[in-house]
Interface confidence: low
């Protein structure tokens, strides 16, 4: 069997067309994941036999092992296969899903198994560690495969880190055949519930064919009993669970639920416990919010992220000037609502490239039957200066007249300089400030108009010189938060003709 | 004392299907998860999926998914699971299994043949 290209591993750009062919004596094919994905089989003109497996528009998902194989209606003697491994980095992708019978791994004895979390892209660093403590385990990694080791009979972990953020894999369960001691874990479908919803929790035990499952709840105080059901948890004899489920919460029943488990023949137990809340309404409450005016840079991108709590989940909506925002089909503005815990939510409005047009009042409205919050705040884009124009004017009476007119926002201040050394300024000379001069050799007028439509400030400042005796260099300086801007104009004596 | 009783042996053509039945007593039925678990000649346990009958909702195992169902007759007391598709690799003893709080029940096995 001969792959071309010839790999064994290849790191393709996301959304990237690319293809492979695999070519042998007999009938061949592609495998991936012991599907056969689509391809061209054809037989060459040499007798030889190919197929082309083109893989399009590609996507984290694709990241794996394809394999080129006789095709097996051939029989045993043709059982050779030749493996390629392909990464698809993608940022949006933390590590490749699971089924769920891969996150159980079964061991027999102490002997080397693999915790096969894999990510999309072979240059992110990838630690193991076991659940319950925060550090990492020296074991070896491979990006193809996973962490290949002797592992304990715990849960265990994947972490990464994509770009700033640390993801986390799916819980792996690591259990050998025989385990005698008890490994319990208690989780609640929900932990917040509102009156009248059900209540259901599982009482896991990892290991033991022969347990007494004992639970306490709120109820029992009242004589009140519910009957748990036992059960065989992801088809795994070795893992047994018991199931407590109360149709209809009231609010007698928020407390602590224990899980209480022993072991029949040696009385060797252990119990684990978790809190549930049932309240009377559903509720959201804003946790984290913004200022009453935010900033956002022209042309620059600008993330808006509103933290709430809430239960159950609510509808988030977000409006600018009282009109509904959606995602624009243009990418000019992205909003996405999530989940950072059972009952926390993050949601972000990002206003990529920001136009000016986009400065206005928003609004966050995150609402469900039971309750609403609502978040608003102005959004002021701001816009570097620019001096838009330098002009001089002779009046009658002697003057000279210098009218400078700038935009911005936040508005520009002015700062009018002169410089009398026309062969050295403004590099080799500082200019000399001006301002309204108590000689009254100059006089500055500035006024200043906000333009709604344009959402930015115009500055017109009007500085008149009485007496101009030499050539003289003015300089009209702009300047607000987001930089400065700055003419000069040359003003001659009335006597001098212009150069 | 909770008691699994399985119908009995069957040996089938490839590609034809089977159905096993398990009759459970002494417990109670409709509260207890009973698991379908076989085991082909020198191999380990496999499970194949189960079925809570209270809640009417079965699990399969990826690999068998769509090739096997599971159903719960509450009036009977029995759970059935129809494999069907069968290949000579399915040849095993086919156990149903369930817990009854202090130690596990199985019943007594059936035997399924696939051969031409």
């Known amino acids: 069997l001969v792959i071309t290209p010839p790999g064994p591993e290849f790191v393709l750009n996301i959304s990237s067309t690319f293809v492979l062919t695999c070519s042998g004596s007999a009938p061949v094919m592609w495998e991936q994941m012991s599907q056969v994905p689509w391809q061209e089989a054809a037989m060459n003109q040499d007798g030889t036999f190919s197929s082309v497996l083109t893989l399009t528009n590609v996507t984290g998902g694709d990241t794996g092992e394809y394999f080129c194989v006789y095709n097996n209606s051939l029989g045993p003697e043709l059982s050779e296969r030749k493996r390629i491994y392909i990464f698809v980095p993608d940022p949006t992708m933390g590590f490749l899903p699971m089924d769920s019978e891969d996150l159980f791994i079964f061991v027999t004895d102490v002997t080397e198994t693999t915790i096969p979390c894999r990510v999309t892209d072979p240059q992110l660093e990838v630690t193991l560690h076991e659940k319950k403590v925060d550090i990492p385990l020296h074991v070896p990694y491979d990006h193809q495969r996973g962490f290949t080791g002797t592992f304990e009979d715990k849960t265990y972990i994947c972490k990464t880190t994509i770009g700033d953020r640390e993801v986390d894999s799916d819980t792996y369960y690591v259990y050998s055949l025989q385990v005698s001691s008890i490994n319990v874990s208690v989780n609640a479908v929900q932990t917040v519930v509102r009156q009248g919803e059900s209540i259901t929790i599982r009482c896991i035990v990892m290991g033991n064919d022969v347990v007494n499952f004992q639970w306490t709840y709120p109820r029992m105080k009242s004589g009140r009993l519910v009957e748990p059901v036992t059960d065989y948890l992801f088809g795994v004899p070795s893992r047994i669970g018991s199931i407590l489920h109360i149709p209809t919460a009231e609010l007698s029943d928020s407390g602590t639920y224990t899980c209480n488990v022993s072991v029949s023949v040696n009385d060797h137990g252990d119990e684990k416990a978790i809190n549930i809340s049932v309240i009377e309404n559903g509720y959201v409450r804003l946790l984290e919010t913004l200022g009453d005016v935010e900033i956002a840079e022209l042309h620059r991108s600008r993330t808006l992220r509103v933290v709430f709590e809430a239960y159950p989940m609510p509808s988030v909506l977000w409006l600018k000037d009282n009109r509904t925002l959606g995602d624009s089909g243009a990418g000019e503005l992205v909003l996405s609502t999530r989940n950072m815990s059972e009952t926390r939510y993050v949601s972000e409005l990002i206003l990529v490239r920001v136009k000016v047009s986009e400065a206005g009042y928003y609004t966050m409205r995150a609402f469900h039957e039971d309750d609403e919050v609502q978040l608003s705040f102005k959004l002021q884009v701001n816009v570097p200066v620019r001096v838009l124009e330098l002009s001089e004017s002779h009046p009658a009476n002697g003057e000279q007249t210098i009218r400078c007119r700038g935009r911005g926002m936040p508005q520009p201040n002015v700062t009018w300089s002169t410089c009398r050394d026309l062969k050295r300024c403004p590099r080799k000379l500082s200019p000399t400030p001006l301002g309204n001069s108590s000689k009254e050799e100059s006089q500055l007028e500035t006024n200043v108009t906000f333009w709604e439509e344009d959402q930015e400030y115009e500055v017109v400042s009007t500085l008149r010189l009485r007496h101009v005796d030499q050539p003289l260099s003015v300089r009209c300086m702009l300047q607000n938060s987001m930089g400065g801007d700055s003419q000069e104009v040359t003003v001659v004596p009335h006597s001098l003709p212009f150069k | 004392q909770v008691q699994l009783v399985q119908s009995g042996a069957e040996v089938k053509k490839p590609g034809s299907s089977v159905r096993v039945s398990c009759k459970a007593s002494?417990?109670?039925?409709?509260?207890?998860?009973i698991s379908w678990v076989r085991q082909a000649p020198g191999q380990g346990l496999e499970w194949i999926g189960g079925i809570l009958p209270i809640l009417k909702t079965p699990n399969y195992a990826q690999r068998f998914q769509g090739r096997v169902t599971i159903n719960a007759d509450e009036s009977t007391s029995t759970v059935y699971m129809e494999m069907s598709s069968l290949r000579s690799e399915d040849t095993a003893v086919y156990y149903c299994?369930?817990?009854?709080?202090?130690?596990?029940?199985w019943g007594q096995g059936t035997l399924v043949t696939v051969s031409s």
């Open positions: 299994a369930t817990h009854g709080g202090d130690r596990s029940y």
């Open positions: 002494g417990g109670t039925f409709s509260r207890h998860a």
